[in-house]
Structures are given as C-alpha cells and as structure tokens.
C-alpha cells in the first residue's frame, strides 16, 4: 500500500522546544511519529536542523525542517507510489534527495520523522505488531524484552549541582520479566526519593529533565552510595545493579579531565586518563557497576582501547560513536568499546539504525537502545528494542509521562507476547546468547 | 541522643510465646530501617529481621520466617518482635539495631533484652 | 546465603602492637562490609562501614580495606580499650551474615 499523504507539523518536545511530528496516510489509515531531540549533540552526528531565528523560539524552531517534509519530501514519496513496507526503499530515496553526508540539507529531524512513520505505516500493512515490523527487517526470528535502565540520579552539565558525571541508572537484572523490572524500578525510585528527602532536603526531590533526581552531590562516590542504599531499602540488592553514563567529553580538558568542572577552572586538579580510569575501577570493586557510558572524551580512543581491554565491565560508545556507521567501525576495529548507544536521531533514519544495531552485533557488542532528553509521547523506541534483541534501553526514570510512555508500551508488548515473551535479564549484554 | 531501650525478654517454656519491644528515641523514628539481632550465650550475632518505614517492607532470615513477626508502632516511637512456636535454641539476648542513613550498617545498638526458653 | 568467615579466632596481643584481622565472604560482596566491636555484656557498636569508611568518633588507629571477597580490618597501635571481640558483617543482600568473631585479649 503506498502512501497517500504526509503532512508534517512544529510540536513540542518534553523541554518545551519546537520538534517535529509527522502524520503519514495510506488507505489503512492515519500514522504519527514525533521525532527527539538531544541536550548536547555530539560532533560527528547528522544534523538536527534548526530555525535560528532568534525571535522566535530562541532560534530553535524547526519550520525549515517541517517544510522540508511538507514540499519537497511528501510530493516525491507520494508521486513515487513506493510501498510502505520497503523501509530501505524510501530511507535511500530520502538519504539521496538530501544528498549531504549529515542530513544537512532536509534535517535529520526531517528524514528520521518521516522515516518513522513509514515504518507504523508498514506494520499496519504487513498486519502484524510494530516490534514484529521491525524485526523482520533486522532479519531477527525472535523477539526480547529489555532489561530497563533508569536513570534516576542526574548530575553533569545539565544538572545544577555539583556532580560531574552526568546519569547514575539502576538495572533490575534479576527481574523474572519486564512488570517486574518495573515495579523493582519504581520501588528503588521511591526509596531513593526519600533517602534523598533525608538527607538533602525536600527541593532536592525536584526532577530533572529525564526524571531523575540531582541532589547537590559533591563526590560521583556519593551518588553510588545513595543508589546502593535505595536499593538495599528497597530489598532488592541482589536483583539491581548500576550503570553509569559520565559524559566525559564535557570535562575533558587538554589531554585531561576536570572532576570538578563547574568550579572555577583550576588546571591543577585535572586528573590523567588513566586516573580517571583507577577511579572507575574502584567504583567497579566497590559496588556492582555493570555499564559505564563515555568514561572518557570522544577523539581521546587510547584511553577508550586501554579501558575496555582492562574493565571486565560494559563500555558503551555514546559521543564516540553517535550512532554513526563510519565512528562504530573504527571503534570495532579499535576495540574501543563493546557497546553501541542506539539514538535513532543521531544517525536519521530507521534503515540506518538498524544497519549501526547489526554492525555493532555482528561485531559481538552489546547495544542499548537510548531515548533524548527532549522526548515525546511518541513510542517506537520501545518497539525498536523489542524488535532489535538488544536486550536493554535507557529511557529515563519511572517519572514523567514521556519517560512512562516508552516503558508502559513495553509493558502493553509483554502482555501481547504472553507466554512467548522473553526478557532479557542477566543476559542483556548479550540476550541472544543460547 | 539516640536511644534505644528493648524490654519483654525472660523466662519462657518451649513453644510459648513473647513479645519484644524496642522504644526508640533521640532522632526521626520513621526515618530509619530497623533491625532485630539475637546473640546466643557465647556466641556469635545473628541478624533476625528488619523493617523499613518508607513502605512497611519486611525481612527475615529464613530461619526465623513464619515463627517471628517484625512490626512497628510509630504514634509510640516502638519496634516489636513477635516470637512463637518458642525453642530452647531461640535462647538468646536480642538486640534492636537501627540502620543508619546508608543502608546495611547498623550504628545505633539497644543494650539487649534476654530470652530464655526452658522448660 | 553468603558465609562470612573470620581468622584469626583469637588472638593475643600486646598494648601497641599492630594488629590485623581478615573476614572472608563465600562470594563477591564488592565493599558491602561493616565491622563491630563488642565488649563482654555490652551491645556491638558500629567500627568500620563500606568495608573502609570510620564513621564519625572512632580513632583513627582503627582502619578497614578490601573489597570484593577478601577484607581486613587492621589496628595500627593496640589501646587497652581495644581488647574485645570483633564481628565483620555483609549487607549484600539479605540475610545479612556476620562472621563467627575474633576475639582479641591481653598477652
């Protein structure tokens, strides 16, 4: 069935700022995808086209992009009667009208709305369930539920404390199943909001962007402390473990790294790469640090090879590898990391995420399939996992509705898959593991 | 000050009953985990159960599941310990122990209220 | 559930002596580690937390390390108010176990 219509709107993201929505039509009806957005973008991603008309929505409206989609994009798609079943199809048709190497021509916002809602669209036609949708064109047979990763201590450049890396997320491994993953994160979630009350007061129980909290930590240790003591209240410390997300590159200086960056700058406390490495592994000793996120800057790949080699942990390549299928084969052949973040929007389009999923695993890697901090209602994250077998997403706390609406679609994919579901748990490295 | 006083313990006959309390004070009752750990004539600690105040959450070691109940009173500052089906192996000095601000240590001891199951 | 094993039993020393005491977890604890003093007919009183940190009025002579299966809580310089018997406990996961105790007398 081909595509009748697409019409693309300006709506608004968790964060307040312009994204895009996309309404595709075909005779089966009417089929939505709203794209995210990042905080921090890294370098060597496809470009997130932006207004930058300063008087209005402080430059970041995206009507450039919904025009894009409106009069260049939505005539040929329809004109070219292209069915939507043939994802690869239409993201190339996308991908060479734009013809620049980092979608900065349409906006991969553009590209990966559109991109999206073909994909809906396809599921509908082939009937069968989205996550089914998505992996039969990744070529999986099966599909797993995902071990949830939450994140619920936020620090970094984005928080207003002290605390230099940027997520602290717990992991319920030794849930039987996805509901009781949940209920495990939720408990700890609310343990954890009143060990903060108690400690750091009631304002420190405000949210952050993700849903999760940033009480004014000084020592990265403390943050490890509040979540092993959240977790032992919860009574499920043998269920939970930890991973981080430190976003190094934002307090990498010169060759160095700066714990305490939000001070006043002080070249001489900024500590070595392989420091900074001693001090991961005297968080890995300590408490049950399974998954460390960008321990160090994006170009500093020594430091990355070193790590990884000597962790015995996940390493998963964030800002180094941006989902872009040029940054992953180095990293695999560099042996860099051994896990890929899946930010659909970082790479543009759904062909291409699942193209950056099947490197990364033909390649033995893990990969954790990511939400943005500018999130929507929109679900096919949840989905994607699903369908990917990657056996692990991050999409924020139990808290706030776009964070929930990931995690309740999950929930809804559970009780459809019934007694064929499959979660992930202890095998989330690796789910498909026999 | 923290303190914390146990009462209830003595002489009790195999298969009886008794009812420990712990009356706590100095600090935020609702605020902490609280534990139970008995100590049997010369020998060693042995951690019975706890209970946290944020969602009435409750632990035993197995040992001691079904026959002691752990609960708590916070209009009266006051932990229990529910022990039945008694045994002259339950014979011991108990202790309530209040878990500190980070989880698993317990920094505030009662002076410990002795049992003695005997026929 | 995770056994906690202590060594010595017992142990004799001298005021000023340097002395240390190892407890072993049947499994990997990371630093969930908590060590006790008690004295006879006296409740335990907290010594040593996350297998390293004093918490707040225990002299600094007291010092703990290790992590992962294998810790040792060390006393720099014997006091005559040290002798007494010491318990080390996991807290990874219930049930919290503690180690048989060392008891620590007067050569």
């Known amino acids: 069935m081909s595509i009748l219509k697409i019409h693309a709107r300006e709506i608004f993201d968790s964060r307040g700022n312009p994204t895009v929505e996309v309404d595709l039509f075909t005779s089966k009806g009417l089929f939505r995808a709203a794209v995210p957005s990042g905080a921090s973008t890294g370098i060597y991603e496809a470009l997130e086209l932006r207004d930058n008309d300063k008087t209005r929505y402080m430059g970041k409206g995206v009507s450039k992009a919904v025009e894009h989609i409106n009069k260049t994009i939505a005539p040929a798609l329809v004109s070219k009667k292209l069915n939507v079943t043939e994802q690869e199809k239409i993201d190339k048709l996308m991908i060479e009208m734009d013809g620049t190497e980092n979608k900065s021509k349409f906006g991969a916002n553009a590209i990966l709305g559109v991109s999206l809602a073909v994909c809906k669209a396809g599921a509908v036609e082939k009937g069968v369930p989205l996550y089914r949708h998505i992996a039969d064109l990744a070529g999986n047979s099966e599909v797993i539920l995902p071990v949830p990763a939450f994140n619920v201590i936020n620090g970094g450049s984005h928080a207003g404390n002290k605390l230099a890396m940027q997520e602290f997320m717990i992991l319920p491994v030794g849930a039987a199943n996805f509901r009781e993953a949940m209920r495990i994160g939720a408990e700890v979630y609310h343990n954890l909001k009143n060990v903060i009350k108690e400690k750091y007061g009631k304002d420190a129980t405000n949210v952050g962007d993700e849903g999760g909290f940033a009480p004014n930590i000084l020592e990265n240790k403390e943050g490890l402390e509040l979540l092993k003591t959240a977790i032992g209240k919860a009574g499920y410390t043998d269920k939970v473990v930890i991973g981080m997300d430190v976003a190094a590159s934002e307090f990498f200086r010169s060759g160095k790294y700066d714990l305490d960056f939000k001070s006043p700058d002080d070249p001489s406390r900024y500590i070595s790469p392989d420091q900074l490495a001693d001090l991961y592994k005297s968080f890995i000793k300590d408490y049950p640090v399974v998954s460390i996120e960008d321990p160090f800057d994006q170009d500093d790949w020594g430091a990355w090879q070193k790590f990884t080699a000597s962790a015995g942990i996940q390493v998963v390549g964030d800002d180094l590898t941006v989902t872009n299928p040029k940054r992953i084969a180095k990293a695999v052949n560099e042996k860099s990391c051994n896990c890929l973040l899946l930010k659909v929007n970082q790479i543009g389009s759904v062909t291409e995420s699942l193209q950056a999923c099947k490197l990364a695993q033909a390649n033995g890697w893990g990969v954790m399939v990511s939400h943005r901090s500018g999130e929507t209602e929109d679900t096919f994250i949840a989905d994607l996992v699903v369908g990917l077998c990657t056996g692990q997403i991050k999409t924020g706390a139990p808290c706030r509705s776009e964070r929930l609406a990931k995690y309740n679609q999950l929930l809804r994919i559970e009780e459809e898959l019934g007694s064929k579901a499959k979660f992930a748990g202890r095998n989330f490295r690796n789910p498909l593991a026999k | 000050e923290v303190q914390l006083v146990e009462s209830g313990g003595g002489l009790v006959q195999p298969g009886g009953s008794l009812r420990l309390s712990c009356a706590a004070s100095g600090y935020t009752f609702t605020s902490c985990v609280m534990n139970w750990v008995r100590q049997a004539p010369g020998k060693g600690l042995e951690w019975v159960a706890y209970?946290?105040?944020?969602?009435?959450?409750?632990k035993y070691n197995e040992k001691f599941k079904g026959r002691f109940t752990i609960s708590r009173d916070d209009s009266k500052n006051t932990l229990y310990l529910q022990m039945n089906s008694l045994r002259a192996e339950d014979t011991a000095v108990y202790y309530c122990?209040?878990?500190?601000?980070?989880?698993?240590?317990?920094?505030?001891w009662g002076q410990g209220t002795l049992v003695t199951v005997s026929s | 559930d995770i056994q906690m094993t202590q060594s010595p039993s017992s142990l004799s020393a001298s005021v000023g002596d340097r002395v240390t005491i190892t407890c072993r977890a049947s499994e990997n604890i990371y630093s969930y580690l908590t060590w006790y003093q008690q004295k006879p007919g006296k409740a335990p009183k907290l010594l040593i937390y996350?297998?390293?940190t004093l918490p707040e009025g225990v002299p600094s002579r007291f010092s703990g390390s290790g992590s992962g299966t294998d810790f040792t809580l060390t006393i720099s310089s014997l006091q005559p108010e040290d002798f007494a018997t010491y318990y080390c406990?996991?807290?990874?996961?219930?049930?919290?176990?503690f180690g048989q105790g060392t008891k620590l007398e007067i050569k």
């Open positions: 406990q996991h807290h990874y996961g219930t049930p919290y176990t």
């Open positions: 209970i946290n105040p944020y969602n009435d959450g409750t």
């Open positions: 122990a209040r878990e500190g601000f980070y989880y698993g240590n317990f920094d505030n």
């Open positions: 996350n297998a390293k």
